[in-house]
Amino acid sequence: PGPPPGPPRVSPDPRAELDSTVLLTRSLLADTRQLAAQLRDKFPADGDHNLDSLPTLAMSAGALGALQLPGVLTRLRADLLSYLRHVQWLRRAGGSSLKTLEPELGTLQARLDRLLRRLQLLMSRLALPQPPPDPPAPPLAPPSSAWGGIRAAHAILGGLHLTLDWAVRGLLLLKTRL
């Protein structure tokens, strides 16, 4: 007798997984853009805001061509994990002014968490190395004032927007190599 029938398809092929990861990243990018605009409407930004604890932007668009799949996914996962922790911190310690960004900030956190799980699943399916995330940074100190919390929110949402924009481009390029 021949081999027993194999299992039916239980989950998406990694290429389909990459497609849905791109869709999820695009959706998160739109959410972030909308939330950043909402923040600017309520609390106009006076210039650029930076937060030393945020990751530096992974890559310029021009350097995308040289990317390798493991490097992109590893770096993206590390950066998004950092942004997730910053969003959690913002919701916890951002002060009453930022309560006006709920429930959108909560939705953003949940979607960011989902994207991270999707990236990890993709890395597992491809059997790409999943190096340990950087050792946890010391806990973020609460903002010194209400305005400090708002400035931090501008920096976090702005940085996340740039990172997700880079991520969409990078993932689309990687799709052609898979």
Epitope: G6, P7, R9, V10, S11, D13, P14, R15, P70, L81, L116, R117, Q120, L121, S124, R125, L126, A127, L128, P129, Q130, P131, P132, P133, L178
Partner: antibody, heavy 114, light 111 residues
Framework: EVQLLESGGGLVQPGGSLRLSCAAS????????MHWVRQAPGKGLEWVAV????????YYADSVKGRFTISRDNSKNTLYLQMNSLRAEDTAVYYC???????WGQGTLVTVSS | QSVLTQPPSASGTPGQRVTISCSGS?????????VHWYQQLPGTAPKLLIY???ERPSGVPDRFSGSKSGTSASLAISGLRSEDEADYYC???????????FGGGTKLTVL
């Protein structure tokens, strides 16, 4: 439907060698990382080795490092496990598995005994 | 000895709810890494039951659910049936080993 069919198992003496093969069909083999996982009689599952979708990354359990080699041929949709310096404790059913692993073969029995 | 710790056995009567735990460390479950669960019926190959902590593959009944918190995870089976009698294994990627690790397995008996 997805099929993973292992072959190459059998009885071998301690210190001997065997090469296991796993023929894959029903899915895009070249898009999946592939694993070998074994199960000694009456025992639990033990991961043996993994190879990335394109063959560029290979990792091994400490218990087989330096003795076993995992490889793949994406043009033939086939996964391999070259097992050298076999020991009695390598006796197990060897499963080939794809992805997380999402899919598993039915396994092939390797018996190491004199 | 397995890297992930599971109780060797669990039991329940038909219709009952049973939970199987899986405990890891900071290099696997606690390292923001996902947990997967497998069911192995007697004499057969393992089958993916839950992936990414709580996702069910198509074809797996919603009586099976998974969750994760900190360095541990659990599999819950509600409305227990006689056909659920099997060995259940948890698995997760381990940062320090650069590969997946399995729990020792839990033999579920339906009384």
């Amino acid at each position: 439907e997805v099929q993973l069919l292992e072959s190459g198992g059998g009885l071998v003496q301690p210190g001997g060698s065997l090469r296991l093969s796993c023929a894959a069909s029903g899915f895009t083999f070249s898009s999946y990382g592939m694993h070998w996982v074994r199960q000694a009689p009456g025992k639990g599952l033990e991961w043996v080795a993994v190879i990335s979708y394109d063959g560029s990354y290979k990792y091994y359990a400490d218990s087989v490092k330096g003795r076993f080699t995992i490889s793949r041929d994406n043009s033939k949709n086939t996964l391999y496990l070259q097992m050298n310096s076999l020991r009695a404790e390598d006796t197990a059913v060897y499963y080939c598995a794809a992805g997380v692993p999402d899919y598993w073969g039915q396994g092939t029995l390797v018996t190491v005994s004199s | 000895q397995s890297v992930l710790t599971q109780p060797p056995s669990a039991s329940g009567t038909p219709g009952q709810r049973v939970t199987i735990s899986c405990s890891g460390s900071s290099s696997n479950i606690g390292s923001d890494l996902d947990v997967h669960w497998y069911q192995q019926l007697p004499g057969t190959a393992p089958k993916l039951l839950i992936y990414s902590n709580e996702e069910r593959p198509s074809g797996v009944p919603d009586r099976f659910s998974g969750s994760k918190s900190g360095t541990s995870a659990s599999l819950a089976i509600s409305g227990l049936r006689s056909e659920d009698e099997a060995d259940y294994y948890c698995a997760a990627w381990d940062d320090s080993l650069y590969g997946p690790v399995f729990g020792g397995g839990t033999k579920l008996t339906v009384l």
